[in-house]
């Protein structure tokens, strides 16, 4: 997480006050467990993760527990409830299924050990949306230049399976990146709202890597990249007549 630290004052200052956090990683400079990330892949569930490296070698720290509260109405619910599921999202995590998740209210979470709070954060679900990677990447040839040196391709993909695109619950924007296989720096294309995009002027004698990632439009952060799609453009002699491509 980055941004200002949330403390118990969050809940006492005003019943609906909320300090927002960025879901990005935060370096754990202290010796106590810290939240590292909260993420919702599809606005219907979310999970939070924390560090626990030092904890293994520290005798005076008790078991780490996560508690949460959400502002359901008029005031923050005064009771903190314990994490509903420590298992489904892996080690040092808490998973909130769809019954516990709504984008329409703010949440606060805290990590405790021996009854004391060691870290605390507040957020709304939309701020922590990071979609799963796009899937089923493929490409087709659009055309080849008259010189036979360059070619244009169309790259297509599908939204992650758990993203409810049809009902408009998620509106994803996509970022495509590509590079020659032996290069280190990726070329970035402008974000788009469609699931296909042309890539122009690729060299026909080179092999390219293409990857795509997505984010919820107007909120959240980019998710992980898709698996890399390899694009090999054969030499000009392997193509049929140039005229066929125009």
């Amino acid at each position: 997480f980055s941004g200002s630290e949330a403390t118990a004052a969050i809940l006492s200052r005003a019943p609906w006050s909320l300090q927002s956090v960025n879901p990005g990683l935060k370096t754990n400079s202290s010796k106590e467990p810290k939240f590292t990330k909260c993420r919702s892949p599809e606005r219907e569930t979310f999970s939070c993760h924390w560090t626990d490296e030092v904890h293994h070698g520290t005798k005076n720290l008790g078991p780490i527990q996560l508690f949460y509260t959400r502002r359901n109405t008029q005031e923050w619910t005064q009771e903190w409830k314990e994490c509903p599921d420590y298992v489904s999202a892996g080690e040092n995590s808490c998973y909130f299924n769809s019954s516990f998740t709504s984008i329409w209210i703010p949440y606060c979470i805290k990590l405790t050990s021996n009854g004391g709070t060691v870290d605390e954060k507040c957020f709304s679900v939309d701020e922590i949306v990071q979609p799963d990677p796009p899937i089923a990447l493929n490409w087709t040839l659009l055309n080849v230049s008259l010189t036979g040196i360059h070619a244009d391709i169309q790259v297509r993909w599908e939204a992650p399976r758990n993203a409810d695109i049809q009902k408009g619950w998620m509106v994803l924007e996509y970022e495509l990146q590509y590079k020659e296989v032996n290069e280190t720096k990726w070329k970035m294309m402008d974000p788009i709202l469609t699931t296909s995009v042309p890539v122009y002027s690729l060299k026909v004698d080179k092999e390219y890597e293409v990857r795509v990632r997505s984010k919820q439009r107007n909120s959240g952060n980019y998710g992980e990249f898709s698996e890399v799609l390899y694009v090999t453009l054969p030499q000009m002699s392997q193509f049929t007549c140039e005229e066929d491509f125009y």
Epitope: R71, T73, Q74, S98, W104, I105, S124, W169
Partner: antibody
Amino acid sequence: EVQLVESGGGLVKPGGSLRLSCAASGFTFSDAWMDWVRQAPGKGLEWVAEIRSKANNHATYYAESVKGRFTISRDDSKNTLYLQMNSLKTEDTAVYYCTLFRDYWGQGTLVTVSS
Amino acid sequence: EIVLTQSPGTLSLSPGERATLSCTATSSVSSSYLNWYQQKPGQAPRLLIYSTSNLASGIPDRFSGSGSGTDFTLTISRLEPEDFAVYYCHQYHRFTPTFGGGTKVEIK
């Protein structure tokens, strides 16, 4: 005590514009998530729009029926919520309520769209 | 969106009687995110119950709520004269927040 007082309603022709205001007091306005909810004459309640706090980047949300025509905004220094309504239609005729988290409600202001 | 259907549309009862109001959702709503409101003529809605069964501040305990999934109920154990009003259910779980069409509780 939470108080929400709406103003700015009135009679407007179809295609016209109107800006509603909601003066808030009795709570920390800058921390609050605020909504507009409307009620057509003799009908039920319809959620219109929401704006979140500065801590939440003043994120805004709209009902499909008003998206692209209405804009919710706020001035935290004045403890005031706004609803800018453009391209008004006859079906926008309603009492517009300003609400805090849809828990506390103002008394509403009537908007009539008619030629 | 999740559509909330309230029944009956109108409930005609006498003071002292028990009122049972129903709210049915087109898809499952977590009990944490369902509220009930009361509205009297010429007044703004007032929050009665939040999270299906919790009484809002200042609401008398003759009001109670229950339910889960797609079926929710508001019960008024003994109707007082001031309880005759329109009642709305409201969900803020998935999609955009929606309200039911309302149930009018009138004096018989």
